[in-house]
Interface confidence: low
């Protein structure tokens, strides 16, 4: 007679279990277990009992113990039930904003989870249960319909799964979806009222007012005031179900001509819009264009100045020839040009008035490296035991790396205060290196010994 212990097990997916196979005869010809699971036999004394560790149990399984005794062969099964919580509990995506009076369908999808007989899906508004159904199908799907009301505004809807293993001596496992927060709204069919000047001059300010009644919730209404592509920044005053948005509009040269003034009220996924035209005249700042803002020494650089077609420009004080909206100059970049500003001034006559605009750009010149006598003297003579600071400055853009070595190894401590010793004497090769190249210079240090009478 073959027996198995335990005869019934519930375990988490991927878990392990010890199964004991026993037989009633003392000397069985055969005693073992039949299972597709990974198994490991534990060594025990005696022949009529074997213990196996079955591991990585991913699904329900029925391992079978068997034995062969003199009085015949027999088997016994153990029933392994795997449990696991769902891998996905999700409310189908919905627009967060819903108009009052609309029917809203909530759909919850549940993937995985076992045993399904113990798995329930619950749809909730806050903590209030709207629907409870067993999980059926893969994925399991539970739906319910809600009529959107004003007082639903801000309510959280969610979906919860309950894997109830309390009858099996375990606990209640709950998984909850990310909440869906419902925002309800009312946007009236009437467009907003827009009051603004019809004509605006560049560099002056006008006031624009946009208002609308009958909104819910008014505090959530977004007001977009725009002149052409330029968004205005209004100050919004709210009433119980109304708002008034007031903005100062400063127009730029980009807005010249006939522009569209827009007031759009967005609430939820709906909007109401009012359009008006505003006529603007302007004059943009000139544009300074360098062929390259960063060049190596000796490179030819073209500097162009371009302005409004009716403007007259000067570039670094030199008027365009002939007088007009464009000027350019050509230069060969020198180290002295590094950081040089190129300034373009444009003048435009608008209604008999002269308007001036400026624009400046800077040129960066890469040069060097340089080592010269002024900043890196070739000869130093110092008394022995005196305190000295060897100075050698390399110039260039980018700033070069400088090393001074005697015999290729002994460094001269540039910029550091040192006590002069005999070791310091000798000729050093100073090498300045940057991405622009490298230069070398010999520096000789002479040490004067003190005389003793």
């Amino acid at each position: 007679q073959t027996s198995v212990s335990p005869s019934k097990v519930i375990l988490p997916r991927g878990g392990s279990v010890l199964v004991t196979c026993s037989t009633s005869c003392d000397q069985p010809k055969l005693l073992g277990i039949e299972t597709p699971l990974p198994k490991k036999e534990l060594l025990l004394p005696g022949n009529n009992r074997k213990v196996y560790e079955l591991s990585n149990v991913q699904e329900d399984s029925q391992p079978m113990c068997y034995s062969n005794c003199p009085d015949g062969q027999s088997t016994a099964k153990t029933f392994l039930t795997v449990y696991w919580t769902p891998e996905r509990v999700e409310l189908a995506p919905l627009p967060s904003w819903q108009p009052v009076g609309k029917n809203l369908t909530l759909r919850c999808q549940v993937e995985g989870g076992a045993p399904r007989a113990n798995l329930t899906v619950v749809l909730l508004r806050g903590e209030k249960e709207l629907k409870r159904e067993p999980a059926v199908g893969e994925p399991a799907e539970v739906t319910t319909t809600v009529l959107v009301r004003r007082d639903h505004h801000g309510a959280n809807f969610s979906c919860r799964t309950e894997l109830d293993l309390r009858p099996q001596g375990l606990e209640l496992f709950e998984n909850t979806s990310a909440p869906y927060q419902l925002q309800t709204f009312v946007l009236p069919a009437t467009p907003p009222q827009l009051v603004s000047p019809r004509v605006l001059e560049v560099d002056t300010q006008g006031t624009v007012v946009c208002s609308l009644d009958g909104l819910f919730p008014v505090s959530e209404a977004q007001v977009h005031l725009a002149l052409g592509d330029q968004r205005l920044n209004p100050t919004v005053t709210y009433g119980n179900d109304s708002f008034s948005a007031k903005a100062s509009v400063s127009v730029t040269a980009e807005d010249e001509g006939t522009q569209r003034l827009t007031c759009a009220v967005i609430l939820g996924n709906q909007s109401q819009e009012t359009l008006q035209t505003v006529t603007i005249y302007s004059f943009p700042a000139p544009n300074v264009i360098l062929t390259k803002p960063e060049v190596s020494e000796g490179t030819e650089v073209t500097v162009k100045c371009e302005a409004h077609p009716r403007a007259k420009v000067t570039l670094n004080g030199v008027p365009a020839q002939p007088l007009g909206p464009r000027a350019q100059l050509l230069l060969k970049a020198t180290p002295e040009d590094n950081g040089r500003s190129f300034s373009c001034s444009a003048t435009l006559e608008v209604a008999g008035q002269l308007i001036h605009k400026n624009q400046t750009r800077e040129l960066r010149v890469l040069y060097g490296p340089r080592l010269d006598e002024r900043d890196c003297p070739g000869n130093w003579t110092w008394p022995e035991n005196s305190q000295q600071t060897p100075m050698c400055q390399a110039w260039g853009n980018p700033l070069p790396e400088l090393k001074c070595l005697k015999d290729g190894t002994f460094p001269l401590p540039i910029g550091e205060s040192v006590t002069v010793t005999r070791d310091l004497e000798g000729t050093y090769l100073c090498r300045a290196r940057s991405t622009q190249g490298e230069v070398t210079r010999k520096v000789t240090v002479n040490v004067l010994s003190p005389r003793y009478e």
Epitope: Q230, L232, Q359
Partner: nanobody
Framework: QVQLQESGGGLVQPGGSLRLSCAAS????????MYWVRQAPGKGLEWVSG????????YYADSVKGRFTISRDGSKKMVYLQMDSLKPEDTAVYFC?????????????????????WGQGTLVTVSS
Amino acid sequence: QVQLQESGGGLVQPGGSLRLSCAASGFTFSNYWMYWVRQAPGKGLEWVSGIDHGGDSTYYADSVKGRFTISRDGSKKMVYLQMDSLKPEDTAVYFCYVQAAAWWSLVGGPPPPPSDYWGQGTLVTVSS
């Protein structure tokens, strides 16, 4: 006189956070896009982030997306860069800048540096 002044840099451990600020003056702040760029030691300029004149549209380089947040405060004339989950490769001098030409103020995307008005920069060092 246009002026941009950055602050908020410093030494921070990997995974830490910093908030950079840029104070702007000398121009109509609400009309212009603002940007942050950075220059790592020995490297060229790298465009980091941009924000439109109204603060509604923001742009980020792929290297900082999801970690950095650009914002602006029109009343204070300030631009901010909130830097979270910092990495050693974020070590750089961070510059604030503004495009000064009028027709750049409303374009729908970030123009490349260099630009017209720059701050002095603030150093951010990410190291353990």
